[in-house]
């Protein structure tokens, strides 16, 4: 099963609109690249509950992107 076929994004579907802040361990942002032409916001959940994709158009995602960009630049 080719997991990372060229042109495949990491997230399937539009993503969740929000995640409880208390459940978030970390947030990662994947910017558009050759593999995926859209921004992806990946939330790692606490207590080994896996990861979820956050809808990049959601209010929470926009806040996270802003926060990360402020920190990085």
């Amino acid at each position: 099963f080719p997991m990372f076929k060229r042109g495949r994004c990491l997230c399937i579907g539009p993503g969740v609109k929000a995640v409880k802040v208390a459940d978030i361990e970390k947030a990662s942002i994947m910017y558009p690249s050759n593999n995926c032409d859209k921004i992806e916001v990946i939330i790692t959940l606490k207590e080994n509950k896996g990861q979820r994709c956050l809808n990049p158009k959601s209010k929470q995602a926009r806040l996270i992107i802003k926060k990360v960009e402020r920190k990085n630049f």
């Epitope: 997991m3 994004c9 990491l10 399937i12 539009p14 993503g15 995640v19 896996g50």
Partner: nanobody
Framework: EVQLVESGGGLVQAGGSLRLSCAAS????????IGWFRQAPGKEREGVSL????????YYADSVKGRFTISSDNAKNTVYLQMNSLKPEDTAVYYC???????????????????WGQGTQVTVSS
């Protein structure tokens, strides 16, 4: 209330075809990825196929590639699994499940799915 209802299972001879349906209510397909899983007696639940209705992308387990086709009808809020060239090893209870925010890495991880149907039995005789 969110509900997934499977139908279309039955008894079929090896080489035959079946079309399973998964009717969703309480949410719109565009917001979720819908996957088909199956579980044979004494075996773990395994992923078969998945569709993301918002962009139409589809995924298949190696064991069913070229034989099964997943599709969706957003107007009917229903996902279909067309199963051709069925083999006795396809015998199982087939479940549909809905996931939001799913990652490719977690494609066939049942715990990452939010809602499940009650299942429909598929029996393939030799």
């Amino acid at each position: 209330e969110v509900q997934l209802v499977e139908s279309g299972g039955g008894l079929v001879q090896a080489g035959g075809s079946l079309r399973l349906s998964c009717a969703a209510s309480g949410f719109t397909l565009n917001d979720y990825a819908i996957g088909w899983f199956r579980q044979a007696p004494g075996k773990e639940r395994e992923g078969v196929s998945l569709i993301s209705s918002d962009d139409g992308s589809t995924y298949y387990a190696d064991s069913v590639k070229g034989r099964f086709t997943i599709s969706s009808d957003n107007a009917k809020n229903t996902v279909y699994l067309q199963m051709n060239s069925l083999k006795p090893e396809d015998t199982a209870v087939y479940y549909c499940a809905a996931a939001q925010g799913l990652l490719l890495l977690s494609l066939w991880v049942p715990t990452q799915y939010d809602y499940w149907g009650q299942g429909t039995q598929v029996t393939v005789s030799s």
